[in-house]
């Protein structure tokens, strides 16, 4: 695959507010050709956020991630990290991207493309050594509700990229820019491949603390912040949802006041969501700031799963 080095394929229109470095696993600068410099941050949920490189918290986060990567390299020359057993699960969890980011992959595949890999979702996590971003579609396994955008707390509102969850293959946007300025920190998860006949919801799960060094991916999400609203108990979970055809433009976790237009051409039309309606063509939730991403229809190998707005989810009173 040819990688164009100059084309800007990640454009940030607005920047996130502070995110604790404890929740981040990777960062990358966008290309110089993008004009406006930005840092693309990846969280443990594989959601991507644009951040202002001039802000002190961003500088500190990058420095911290660089140190972490250097420590990993020193401790064995690999970025692999044990995070306990991550058992194969039956449902994918979505990665995500900031809605303020515009992805501009070329249909020729010369720049960046949405490219399915033959590996399973867990294998992709175990392999995840590519230093290139974004990888909003390499999901962590497990079921989680989408978080409420941090409106009440002055947090990252309306700054997350759209989510494109993996299915059986884990797709990755291949960034055309070399990873800079710091070393890659793709914290990997070892997976236990032993199949389980037990229902995942009743299956006992285990995690052991690793040899001393931080282990990274996958953080639980809640759909509310303390002092705002109670915890949902019976909200929809990802594993309750059926597959969604790839031709839908269904995105989730839009912050207040945002708009999406994503041109995605169908590769299949099987499967319907069990809970949520899915629009075909363009879908514009809570309009304000546009995102436009065009993807090569030949390379589109993921399903896009809608998740109900967390604010509208059933809440426990």
């Amino acid at each position: 695959q040819h990688h164009g080095v100059t084309k800007c394929n990640i454009t940030c229109s607005k920047m996130t507010s502070k995110i604790p470095v404890a929740l981040l696993i990777h960062y990358q600068q966008n290309q110089a050709s993008c004009g406006k410099r930005a840092i693309i941050l990846e969280t443990r949920q594989h959601r991507l956020f644009c951040a202002d490189p001039k802000e002190q918290w961003v500088k500190d986060a990058m420095q911290h991630l660089d140190r972490q990567a250097a420590a990993l390299t020193r401790n064995g020359g690999t970025f692999e990290k044990q995070i306990g057993e991550v058992k194969p699960r039956t449902t994918p969890a979505a990665g995500g991207m900031d809605e303020s980011v515009v992805l501009e992959p070329e249909a020729t595949g010369e720049s960046s493309s949405l490219e399915p890999t033959p590996s399973s979702q867990e294998a992709q996590r175990a392999l995840g050594t590519s230093p290139e971003l974004p990888t909003g579609v390499t999901g962590s396994s497990g079921t989680r509700l989408p978080p409420t955008p941090k409106a009440q707390d002055g947090g990252p509102v309306g700054t997350e990229l759209f989510r494109v969850p993996p299915v059986s293959t884990a797709a990755t946007w291949q960034s055309s820019a070399p990873h800079q300025p710091g070393p890659s920190l793709w914290a990997e998860a070892k997976t236990s491949e032993a199949p389980s006949t037990q229902d995942p919801s009743t299956q006992a799960s285990t995690a052991s603390s690793p040899a001393p060094e931080e282990n990274a991916p996958s953080e639980g999400q809640r759909v509310w912040g303390q002092g705002q609203s109670p915890r949902p108990e019976n909200s929809l979970e990802r594993e309750e949802m059926g597959p969604v055809p790839a031709h839908t433009d269904a995105f989730q976790d839009w912050g207040p006041g945002s708009m999406a237009h994503v041109s995605v051409v169908p590769v299949s039309s099987e499967g319907t969501p069990s809970r949520e309606p899915v629009a075909s063509g363009s879908w514009t939730p809570k309009a304000e700031e546009p995102i436009h991403a065009t993807m090569d229809p030949q390379r589109l190998g993921v399903l896009i799963t809608p998740v109900p707005d967390a604010q509208a989810a059933t809440r426990r009173q």
Epitope: K18, I19, P20, V21, A22, L23, T43, R44, Q45, R47, F49, Q56, W57, D60, I83, G84, E85, V86, K87, R89, A93, S140, S141, G142, T143, R144, L145, P147, T148, P149, K150, D153, G154, G155, P156, A189, S201, S205, T206, A207, S209, E214, N215, P217, S218, E219, G220, Q221, R222, V223, W224, G225, Q226, R231, P232, E233, N234, S235, E237, R316
Partner: antibody, heavy 122, light 107 residues
């Protein structure tokens, strides 16, 4: 109402292993992190690690040197913290807690269990 | 690891007093700080978190301030139920760390 109910006090000998339970109710157990925090007598609080029952992901404080294992039974909404190779300095109250935030907010602890006292003595 | 240093370690005050507890981090924590109150034999209770947001059900006499590495918890007018031990916790980076605690006693 969100509640975390922990198992009762334990007395163990040095070198033994203890397993403390934390039963959650009032929210979707698999979606939110369970944290474990140690408080030695007359001392402050020390974070041991977090664990997400939904996908078995976890992160631990290096200080516990691989002695901590966390398990969960999703059918009963119960998390377990196992501490092995016990020594006298492990004598403490152990709390489970949950963090309320989405992944951009961070891990502060809004709900706590009542605590489980562990005494390690020969 | 980020070390959290709380001061004073103990404090005597009277009902109605204004009290300030400080917490200093060994590195910048970007306001990712929480304050907890703990009474003897009980679990800690969340008071404030990120950017000095008051937790649900916490009286408005509790407030927080600070930035960078230095933070303060202020109780504007002490009530009898406020006598307890207070802890700060940073959650900017792991391992998450707590201050050593400030024991607030009745004068």
């Amino acid at each position: 109402e969100v509640q975390l109910v922990q198992s009762g006090a334990e007395v163990k000998k040095p070198g033994a292993t203890v397993k403390i339970s934390c039963k959650a109710s009032g929210y979707t157990f698999t979606n939110y992190n369970i944290h474990w925090v140690q408080q030695a007598p007359g001392k402050g609080l020390e974070w041991m690690g977090w664990y997400l029952p939904g996908d078995d992901s976890s992160k631990f404080n290096e200080r516990f040197e691989g002695r901590v294992t966390i398990t969960a039974d999703r059918s009963t909404n119960t998390a377990y913290m196992e501490l092995s190779s016990l020594r006298s300095e492990d004598t403490a109250v152990y709390y489970c807690a949950t963090s309320p935030t989405d992944e951009t907010q961070g891990d502060y602890f809004d709900y706590w269990g009542q605590g489980t006292t562990l005494t390690v003595s020969s | 690891d980020i070390r959290m240093t709380q001061s004073p370690s103990s404090l005597s005050a009277s009902v109605g007093d204004r009290v300030t507890i400080t917490c200093r981090a060994s590195g910048r924590i970007h306001d990712f700080l929480a304050w907890y109150q703990q009474k003897p034999g009980k679990a800690p209770k969340l008071l404030l978190y990120t950017d000095n947001t008051l937790a649900e059900g916490v009286p408005s006499r509790f407030s927080g301030s600070g930035s960078g590495t230095d933070y303060t918890l202020t109780i504007s007018s002490l009530q009898p139920e406020d006598f307890a031990t207070y802890y700060c916790q940073q959650f900017w980076s792991t391992p998450y760390t707590f201050g050593g605690g400030t024991k607030l006693e009745i004068k």
